[in-house]
Interface confidence: low
């Protein structure tokens, strides 16, 4: 349905708190360095039009596109040219393409200081002196940081944001009440950016078929009682949400995912019984809370696949008709028998089944030839079930920190022309999954620990395009979606990497490593670490081990010292030196 | 919303030439990487090439390897695919679509016959 005006339609769906919003946000991710001051200006400035637009839709202007008002807007900020370079050529562009060329420019690993948590005494006088101020800069912040970040779902965050200053600013301990719960926030926010940016990695790179694969299965295993019809529709609605969060048009998309939480509460009945309690929360905690509701339970009387994918013979009639929907239809039965199934693996599977159906089909007896493909599903199964198990034994041995260590050689050997803070950050968040997995009972670990890893991978992919360096990487990132892990999982030590020359700069230690947090000083050492294996890729666990062991016990001798930097200084060489004969 | 319009079919010699393009339109086309498919008669649906969003990085499937060429304007929002030597066996309706190997054509197509 069109509108006379598109901002003025958006303005009264939405309202005017979370227009304010989105836009802040949408411009936040488009003009990642702009100062913050800046993009209030421009916001207010667009508000007030909106305003001028809903009194009267026919007003000067108001029947414009959205990109084209925030365009000509963002293209109105003074020292674009000198902030962004050869983005400022976008605004010699035309609608669409100006729109495009802004999305071609967001930055995934923007050159912005990492954001320092003042005092809280600070933060609480901050939010009392200008509470409205002091959301916006949460906003601001989080989207520049995150330009892919789920725009409605960054409000439900910041709403979060405030409600734990306004609870805990008041409470006898501020800092016991309100740190936790930042830090809670900071956790879910840094899943809910890389979650999304898979997503948008998924629509963008792989088409949205890939994407309705995804959600086909995911949306099935959530809803096993709904019916295909049903789980369809919630598909079509979920990948237009997401194609314009992805595009950068905020306001489309946050209309519409309140469009299909409305939808979905509507319809509970045919949907899951699990969405009741959602439906009774206001709109940006209900569309959460049915973002993440649990899986409904299976119905009891499923029948076996068998018959229809396997046994029947109108399998390739069936699947010429309607190739999409027959492989959707498949895809939805055996995801809503699955919930113990990563999303990837069912993935594989319809990848399997579908290869199957296009050989046997062209045989002279199809039936015959396809009458074994649910065995050929075995190993698929198996080796993500492996994976899990050894891991998790693995993690359950060393603890969180050493199992990072271990991932961190593991990685680094396979591709050691990534950038060290690359595989630092990546090794350590994929070390992550085990406690955030391996604690869970067996029907929930493989689901758990293969998708979440996805995530973790995409973000290697994503970095690592902006910075290609490793035909490996560009390989596994760009050759199948739901390959992605498999194809890390089985490269081996890179046999043609010539290792990196000893440089002691890099192994020089100072006393302000004393003062840092055990997060930050583990990522020093981390660091250390991948570099050592870049300079030999071929040392054994054991040497490696020895040389981690000497370095923590360098630091925490010279760290107890009373002249500190003096014992670094003169125990850091002997280290160096021992490090390079142990690892000769 | 999204558009794809496919044109440059048409009647063809075998060893011709064409060269197909696709106009896009309610979409990031710079952000997103983008194939050509094609159906023969009473066929289905065959991946034919893919590029990348920035038109870097281009694959074929094999039965036109050599033969043909897959490329994009991102200032026109335009996908184009020249297609030389051509054989009866690519007679077919051409379609583009949003996406690499994979991915789903959703505008008219463009027929493209190759008969003496």
């Known amino acids: 349905d069109t509108h006379k005006s598109e901002v003025a339609h958006r303005f009264k769906d939405l309202g005017e708190e979370h227009f304010k919003g989105l836009v802040l946000v949408a411009f936040s991710q488009y003009l990642q360095q702009c100062p913050f001051e800046e993009h209030v200006k421009l916001v207010n400035e667009v508000t007030e039009f909106a305003k001028t637009c809903v009194a009267d839709e026919s007003a000067e202007n108001c029947d414009k596109s959205l990109h084209t008002l925030f365009g000509d807007k963002l293209c109105t900020v003074a020292t674009l040219r000198e902030t962004y370079g050869e983005m400022a050529d976008c605004c010699a562009k035309q609608e669409p393409e100006r729109n495009e060329c802004f999305l071609q420019h967001k930055d995934d690993n923007p050159n912005l200081p990492p954001l320092v948590r003042p005092e809280v005494d600070v933060m609480c006088t901050a939010f009392h002196d200008n509470e409205a101020t002091f959301l916006k800069k949460y906003l601001y912040e989080v989207a520049r940081r995150h330009p892919y970040f789920y725009a409605p779902e960054l409000l439900f965050f910041a709403a979060r944001y405030k409600a734990a200053f306004a609870e805990c600013c008041q409470a006898a301990d501020k800092a016991a009440c309100l740190l936790p719960k930042l830090d809670e926030l900071r956790d879910e926010g840094k899943a809910s950016s890389a979650k999304q940016r898979l997503k948008c990695a998924s629509l963008q790179k792989f088409g949205d078929r890939a994407f309705k694969a995804w959600a086909v299965a995911r949306l099935s295993q959530k809803f096993p009682k709904a019916e295909f019809a049903e789980v369809s529709k919630l598909v079509t609605d979920l990948t237009k949400v997401h194609t314009e969060c992805c595009h950068g048009d905020l306001l489309e998309c946050a209309d519409d995912r309140a469009d299909l939480a409305k939808y979905m509460c509507e319809n509970q009945d045919s949907i899951s019984s699990k969405l009741k309690e959602c439906c009774d929360k206001p709109l940006l905690e209900k569309s959460h809370c049915l973002a993440e509701v649990e899986n409904d339970e299976m119905p009891a009387d499923l029948p076996s696949l068998a018959a229809d994918y396997v046994e029947s013979k109108d399998v390739c009639k069936n699947y010429a008709e309607a190739k999409d929907v027959f492989l959707g239809m498949f895809l939805y039965e055996y995801a809503r028998r699955h919930p113990d199934y990563s999303v990837m693996l069912l993935l594989r599977l319809a990848k399997a089944y579908e290869a199957t159906l296009e050989k046997c089909c062209a045989a002279a007896d199809p039936h015959e030839c396809y009458a074994k493909v649910f065995d050929e599903f075995q190993p698929l199964v198996e080796e993500p079930q492996n994976l899990v198990k050894q891991n998790c034994e693995l993690f359950e041995q060393l603890g969180e920190y050493k199992f990072q260590n271990a991932l961190l050689v593991r990685y680094t050997k396979k591709v050691p022309q990534v950038s060290t803070p690359t595989l630092v950050e990546v090794s350590r968040n994929l070390g992550k999954v085990g406690a955030k997995c391996c604690k869970l009972p067996e029907a929930k670990r493989m689901p758990c620990a293969e998708d979440y890893l996805s995530v973790v991978l995409n973000r290697l992919c994503v970095l690592h395009e902006k910075t290609p360096v490793s035909e490996k990487v560009t390989k596994c990132c760009t050759e199948s979606l739901v390959n992605r892990r498999p194809c890390f999982s089985a490269l081996e030590l890179d046999e043609a990497y010539v290792p990196k020359a000893f440089n002691a700069e890099t192994f020089t230690f100072h006393a302000d490593m004393c003062t840092l947090s055990e997060k930050e000083k583990q990522v020093k050492k981390q660091t250390a670490l991948v570099e050592l294996v870049k300079h030999k890729p071929k040392a054994t666990k054991e040497q490696l081990k020895g040389v981690m062991d000497n370095f923590a016990a360098f630091v925490e001798k010279c760290c107890k010292a009373d002249d500190k930097e003096a014992c670094f200084a003169e125990e850091g060489p002997k280290f160096v030196a021992a490090s390079q004969a142990a690892l000769a | 919303q999204v558009q794809l319009v496919e044109s440059g079919g048409g009647l063809v010699q075998p060893g011709g030439s064409l060269r197909l393009s696709c106009a896009a339109s309610?979409?990031?086309?710079?952000?997103?990487?983008m194939s050509w498919v094609r159906q023969a008669p009473g066929k289905g649906f065959e991946w034919v090439s893919s590029?990348?969003?920035?038109?870097?990085?281009?694959r074929y499937a094999d039965s036109v390897k050599g033969r043909f060429t897959i490329s994009r304007d991102n200032a026109r929002n335009t996908l184009y695919l020249q297609m030389n030597s051509l054989k009866p066996e690519d007679t077919a309706v051409y379609y583009c679509a949003i996406g690499g190997p994979g991915a789903s054509p959703s505008g008219q197509g463009t027929q493209v016959t190759v008969s003496s």
């Open positions: 590029i990348n969003n920035g038109g870097s990085d281009t």
């Open positions: 309610g979409f990031a086309f710079r952000g997103f990487g």
